[in-house]
Interface confidence: low
């Protein structure tokens, strides 16, 4: 526990003099002072300092009516002038005045720091009525003061639309430390110095600052509030709390992890979302990130393939979102999947690796050694290939697309014929005499259609003699 | 691939000094911690030291001051350990592990050990 | 500094079996500190499980560990011959790191 350091104030008498009910005569008309109507200062006597000349802020009331008789000057009477007390303990100050009966309607309004307390704040005013003047008392009252009742407290009266001004009553709310900036956890590199800051108030002042660090004293000696702290440098994670002390106690901050940036774990859950014959939509959820920020990513991807030369393959992305679409990838494959993310430290290592299988795509190749032509005794062109060389299929063969475009005096039609995966070799009936026949052919899959081969033309005469087109695309060894 | 290559077994005599070797290689050398870790037969593991090869900070287990004395060579990425004073109580396995440092400070690799025996 | 305390010191099982090793800390650590490792006779460590709960690279999924505070486990699902080994747990939340004296898991 905490014990208070100095005696709280007592709060003067509201009345140094009689009780009301037979308050004392104001005697300052007895100094000769020279009357003027409106107002102006008054000497009157403090009754805290008795005897004392003090010029408080007074208003000289006018002549009565009758012209013959000087009423009293209006002042608010000295109270208190400073309360210290310590927090959540009650506090009642008050302002008194003496008003002429021929007053009326006063009222006294209380201020803080120069702003009209309203509302819900406990002011009691109470009237003690005599044969020419009423004595006012205004009582404020704060139960559990807070740091935020501190301030400067005023009582105001408007009369005649003046306004008299009590002496401040200021009141001063000690307690514990109150820290205004408290260390922050912080992310910091291995052995790279960094600081910390703290900050408490009182009152009472002054506040001493020590730092703590993993449960033991930094410094020696204390420092004045605020202070800043320079590690020069940690290995390994810290905790650090500052201690505020006072004369009333100490208060201690929160206490703040600061942690070493490291390398980040690895990443896990990496997923396949969706394939297609050359891309692989992969997700994955991030590893711990080491206390700092991911920078960016790396897709590993290595064919599984006894034929393949093992390289790896490295997409880098971003860190965010947590999904890369892999490309470029052989169709019909199976292709094992890493995912690496970096931090300023450096990279992870990888996740554990999966496995992921691109789908069938179209052939990649055209037919080869295309050789058109012309039958007539039957009216067809005859149509010969050779089925695409490639070291790997794109999917299992389904058949061939031929097209046929037949050309003649500004007329032109393209018809396509689908033959089985078997054939080498189609026949097609003559469309049009003496025209143009140009014919292409495609590999089909199931995953699609390949490219064409080059086009290979025939002339079809009208009648007779015979025209034969070379193959398109010789075969390796052939040309 | 992360690789940690450990110098071969050693037989020494009471009272001589030794020093282990521990070379690195398939990641960065200095953004890992070394540390080294003593298992003599049939017993746990013990934690000597570690040493971070960015800026040669070392950080040891109490016990072992004065016994161990880390150091690395950053342009071999080799890490070694000297131990002075040799005792039977020395005789162990010796294993470098790469440590994932530093505030969950775990071993992801670990080298093959080197087996130290001290007799006379 | 943090002593680890294991158990059963050894144990042995059959395949098909659960097995749960039981780690306990002299001091709190945060679950993301305690790390178990396998060893093999002849062999160095292998690391098992890093952060209480997440598996290092390549090893099954039969492998589960859990905890917080002072306590931790590590399970085996259904054993299998090839898990027969030393298991360690490892805190790496203060210096000196500190490793448990060791679960050794037989074949029955």
């Known amino acids: 526990a905490i014990t208070e350091a100095r005696e709280e104030a007592k709060p003067y008498p509201l009345f140094p003099g009689p009780l009301p009910g037979s308050l004392q005569t104001d005697h300052t008309s007895l100094l000769s002072l020279p009357h003027t109507s409106g107002y102006q200062p008054a000497l009157m006597f403090s009754p805290t300092q008795p005897g004392r000349p003090y010029t408080g802020n007074v208003a000289i009331p006018r002549v009565t009516s009758a012209g013959s008789k000087l009423l009293p000057p209006l002042a608010f009477k000295h109270t208190v002038g400073h309360i210290i007390l310590s927090e959540h303990k009650d506090v009642k100050f008050n302002c008194s005045i003496s008003v002429p009966n021929i007053y009326q309607d006063t009222t006294i309004s209380w201020w803080k720091d120069g702003k009209e307390l309203l509302g819900a704040h406990h002011a009691i005013t109470q009237f003690y009525p005599d044969d020419e003047v009423t004595a006012i008392i205004a009582s404020f009252s704060i139960t559990s003061v807070q740091r935020s009742d501190n301030g400067s407290y005023i009582c105001k009266m408007k009369i005649n639309n003046e306004e008299i001004v009590s002496d401040p009553i200021y009141i001063e709310v000690q307690g514990l430390p109150h820290f205004t900036k408290q260390p922050e956890s912080m992310n910091v590199t291995r052995n790279t110095a960094f600081n910390l800051t703290c900050q408490a108030v009182g009152p009472p002042e002054p506040v001493n600052i020590f730092w703590v660090q993993n449960s033991s004293r930094v410094n020696e000696q204390p420092e004045k509030s605020p202070s800043v702290l320079t590690v020069p440098g940690l290995t390994e994670m810290a905790v650090f709390s500052c201690e505020a002390h006072n004369d009333k106690g100490l208060t201690v901050s929160k206490g703040v992890q600061i942690n070493i940036k490291a390398i980040p774990s690895p990443p896990t859950e990496v997923s396949i979302h969706n394939s297609t014959a050359h891309s692989i939509l992969i997700s994955w959820v991030p590893g711990f990130d080491g206390y700092s920020p991911f920078r960016n990513c790396s897709v590993q991807v290595k064919e599984v393939d006894p034929l393949s030369n093992g390289s790896v393959m490295i997409f880098n992305t971003s860190a965010s979102p947590h999904m890369y679409q892999i490309k470029q990838l052989q169709a019909l494959a199976n292709y094992s999947i890493g995912v690496s993310c970096m931090n300023e430290i450096g990279w992870s290592a990888v996740s554990p690796w999966i496995l992921a299988s691109t789908t069938e795509g179209a052939p990649s190749v055209a037919p080869l050694n295309v050789t058109v032509f012309l039958n007539e005794s039957r009216d067809n062109v005859d149509i010969r290939w050779m089925k695409p060389l490639t070291k790997r299929q794109a999917g299992e063969l389904v058949g061939y697309r031929i097209s046929h475009v037949w050309q003649s005096a500004g007329i032109s039609k393209e018809l396509l014929e689908e033959v089985g995966q078997n054939n080498s070799r189609a026949q097609i009936s003559v469309q049009v005499h003496n025209a143009t026949c140009t014919v292409r052919i495609a590999a089909v899959t199931k995953g699609g259609v390949g490219p064409f081969s080059d086009p290979v033309k025939i002339f079809i005469p009208a009648h007779g003699w015979v025209d034969h087109a070379p193959s398109s695309t010789p075969a390796p060894g052939n040309a | 691939q992360v690789q940690l290559q450990q110098s071969g077994p050693e037989l020494v005599k009471p009272g001589a000094s030794v020093k282990l070797s521990c070379k690195a290689s398939?990641?960065?050398?200095?953004?890992?911690?070394i540390n080294w870790v003593k298992q003599r037969p049939g017993l746990g593991l013990e934690w000597i030291g570690w040493i971070y090869p960015r800026d040669g900070y070392t950080k040891y287990n109490e016990k072992f001051k004065g016994k161990a004395t880390l150091a690395v060579d950053t342009s071999s990425s080799t890490a070694s350990m000297e131990l002075h004073s040799l005792t039977s109580e020395d005789s162990a396995v010796y294993f470098c592990a790469r440590g994932y440092y530093d505030n969950l400070y775990y071993f992801d690799n670990w080298g093959p050990g080197t087996t130290l025996t001290v007799s006379s | 500094e943090n002593v680890l305390t294991q158990s059963p010191t050894t144990v042995a099982a059959s395949p098909g079996e659960k097995i749960t090793i039981t780690c306990s800390a002299s001091?709190?650590?945060?679950?993301?500190?305690l790390h178990w490792y396998q060893q093999k006779p002849g062999f160095s460590p292998k690391l098992l499980i890093y952060r209480t709960s997440n598996l290092a690279s390549g090893v099954p999924a039969r492998f589960s560990g859990s905890g917080s505070g002072t306590s931790y486990s590590l399970t085996i699902g259904t054993m299998e011959a090839e898990d027969a080994a030393t298991y360690y747990c490892?805190?790496?939340?203060?210096?000196?790191?500190?490793f448990g004296a060791g679960t050794k898991l037989e074949l029955k």
């Open positions: 001091s709190i650590i945060s679950s993301n500190y």
């Open positions: 490892q805190q790496g939340r203060s210096v000196p790191l500190t």
């Open positions: 398939g990641y960065t050398f200095t953004t890992y911690d």
